[in-house]
Interface confidence: medium
């Protein structure tokens, strides 16, 4: 999102996501932020605090177990993706406070706002990997006993990260800073140089690969898993279902506004009233998507409390219980014993 639809090929210091409210009179330098921006700031602040502390705790808990516990590998990678994205928040926060002025330079403009998209792709690909793991545990338990190991899990995570980086490249390449005036400021955003087809292509790929296809495949995947676990009368099927729904649903719920507004803006003319309205909501949509970066630790804690009745243990031990219990393939039944089997699929499959 954040498109400029702007080119200035002929001047040297063309060096930026949201533009000024250009369709209204400019009564003052407009020192008051718009309501969507204020809401975005509140969300950013909460996400940063919860996301950095929560994901740091998850990383700390899972890092020690990652050598021997496959579930820990999944959660570790998801937490790292979320943690990295949260590191960009102070800069994004500062920019919104300054009415979207971007004083941090071109390199920061390319990298920092792209982190949330890297998180989206990394999370959804890791979630797909975790889902495949869940699926195999249920439907191919013998294969899992023979081949399911930490080495393979790390390779799968590396592939997921590599693909995520590749898919983030378009956003990275088209992101630039540019000057704006009345009043003077530098903005950070994407510039497709009036190429609407290219802009639409990027938005469609993002929607399909980052949202619709994962939604379809994960829905099918977990439908099969839950049907099997129910048919085998798994003792934890109800709780498992709740965790799965919470984890997967959170990803799609929090990314929905960003994806919808993004695809709409790519098909609208920049001067249209709807485009300008969506532009004003852009920061709010991004902040809403950013909730994914702090929701996982919350789900883990809530799930842990649910499984243990009350929070009698310390937070680290509760998380360790939730995140590092290894799935065991039973010989007689094809379902996992892990308290949070399906928690693995969470992580904001962004």
């Amino acid at each position: 999102m954040d498109s400029f639809n702007y080119t200035t090929p002929d001047y040297g210091h063309y060096d930026d996501k949201d533009t000024l409210d250009l369709n209204t009179p400019v009564d003052k330098t407009s020192n008051t932020l718009r309501v969507p921006d204020i809401l975005a700031l509140v969300i950013f602040a909460v996400v940063f605090l919860v996301g950095v502390l929560g994901n740091a705790l998850v990383v700390w808990v899972t890092a020690f177990e990652a050598k021997r516990t496959i579930n820990a590998i999944w959660f570790l990678n998801l937490a790292v993706a979320d943690f990295l994205s949260c590191l960009a928040l102070p800069i994004l926060f500062t920019s919104i406070v300054q009415h979207h002025h971007w004083p941090f330079g071109g390199a920061a403009c390319s990298i920092l706002p792209s982190l949330i998209l890297l998180n989206m792709y990394a999370s959804i690909l890791l979630l797909a990997t975790i889902s495949a793991d869940r699926f195999l545990l249920v439907f191919k338990p013998i294969w899992c006993q023979n081949f399911r190991g930490a080495g393979l899990a790390w390779i799968a995570c590396a592939v997921a990260w590599g693909l995520a980086l590749l898919l983030t490249i378009p956003s990275f390449l088209y992101r630039v800073v540019r000057e704006e005036y009345f009043p003077p400021k530098v903005l950070c955003g994407v510039d497709y140089s009036h190429d609407k087809r290219r802009e639409r292509a990027v938005a469609i790929v993002r929607l399909v690969l980052g949202f619709l296809w994962p939604l379809l495949t994960l829905t099918i995947c977990y439908t099969f898993i839950l049907l099997r676990t129910w048919s085998r009368r798994a003792t934890r099927s109800t709780k498992t279902l709740k965790v799965v729904v919470a984890v997967v649903a959170s990803f799609f719920i929090f990314w929905l506004p960003y994806q919808v507004t993004g695809i709409m803006m790519s098909f609208l003319e920049p001067s249209s009233p709807t485009f300008l309205l969506l532009k004003k909501l852009d920061s709010l949509c991004v902040s809403f998507a950013y909730i994914n970066c702090c929701i996982n630790p919350i789900i883990y804690v809530v799930a842990g409390q649910g499984f243990q009745g009350r929070l009698r243990k310390s937070l680290p031990s509760l998380l360790r219980n939730v995140l590092t219990e290894e799935s065991v393939v039973r010989e007689s039944k094809s379902f996992t014993r892990s308290t949070v089997d399906t928690m693995a699929q969470k992580t904001q499959a962004v």
Epitope: N5, T8, D10, G12, L22, F182, P183, P184, P270
Partner: antibody, heavy 119, light 112 residues
Framework: DIQLQESGPGLVKPSQSLSLTCSVT?????????WNWIRQLPGNKMEWMGH???????RYNPSLKNRISITRDTSKNQFFLKLNSVTTEDTATYYC????????????WGQGTLVTVSA | DVVMTQTPLSLPVSLGDQASISCRSS???????????LHWYLQKPGQSPKLLIY???TRFSGVPDRFSGSGSGADFTLQISRVEAEDLGVYLC?????????FGAGTKLVLT
């Protein structure tokens, strides 16, 4: 070389609308910067009225309230000023000007057109 | 709006003289980005304004080096080291730091 040229009626009746055209040569109005209307009132007082940017969005001087509209025709590389409900106080020389980002100022101006509001 | 006050309103000079025109703004024109968006224009009789100096002191292309701009904050000066006949006209200062951009009333450079 960037050139701007204003055109339009020199006489407008009070309460009617004033419409002017600025034709641009040597640069595409969709390529960047701000395309402005500025007027010089009697006594040399210069007043910025508003602009249309390369993507078609506008900004206006609040002193003109809701009377002003700036539009464009990209196929003809022209942009337009429409000022509604004019009074004798709108008598002025009207200039179109390019606010060029490299200079952060109104670097290129049209020659201006005098518009008189009179019954 | 930011008010731009120019002094004097009329400046009589002889050819070859040095001329100095002052421009004062009602608030500082220093932007938080470190730039000061104060510009000078020359409007000759019957013509449109032409950009002379932008951002306080940078000469626009084709402007002779006898023109120089200086100042900071809210006080600025345009100096012409040796006035020539082609320099006669109205000098306007303008700011684009604040919204809306505003202009001074002008200083008319005339021959004594």
């Amino acid at each position: 070389d960037i050139q701007l040229q204003e055109s339009g009626p020199g006489l407008v009746k009070p309460s009617q609308s004033l419409s002017l055209t600025c034709s641009v040569t040597g640069y595409s109005i969709t390529s960047g910067h701000y395309w402005n209307w500025i007027r010089q009132l009697p006594g040399n007082k210069m007043e910025w009225m508003g602009h249309i940017s390369n993507d078609g969005s506008n900004r206006y001087n609040p002193s003109l309230k809701n009377r002003i509209s700036i539009t464009r025709d990209t196929s003809k590389n022209q942009f337009f000023l429409k000022l509604n409900s004019v009074t004798t106080e709108d008598t002025a020389t009207y200039y179109c000007a390019l606010f060029y980002f490299a200079y952060a100022s109104f670097a290129y101006w049209g020659q201006g057109t005098l518009v008189t509001v009179s019954a | 709006d930011v008010v731009m006050t120019q002094t004097p309103l009329s400046l009589p000079v002889s050819l070859g003289d040095q001329a100095s025109i002052s421009c004062r703004s009602s608030q500082s024109l220093l932007h938080s980005n470190g730039n000061t968006y104060l510009h000078w224009y020359l409007q000759k009789p019957g013509q449109s304004p032409k950009l002379l100096i932008y951002k306080v002191s940078t000469r626009f292309s084709g402007v002779p080096d006898r023109f120089s701009g200086s100042g900071s904050g809210a006080d600025f000066t345009l100096q012409i080291s040796r006035v020539e006949a082609e320099d006669l006209g109205v000098y306007l200062c303008s700011q684009s730091t604040h919204v809306p951009p505003t202009f001074g009333a002008g200083t008319k450079l005339v021959l004594t």
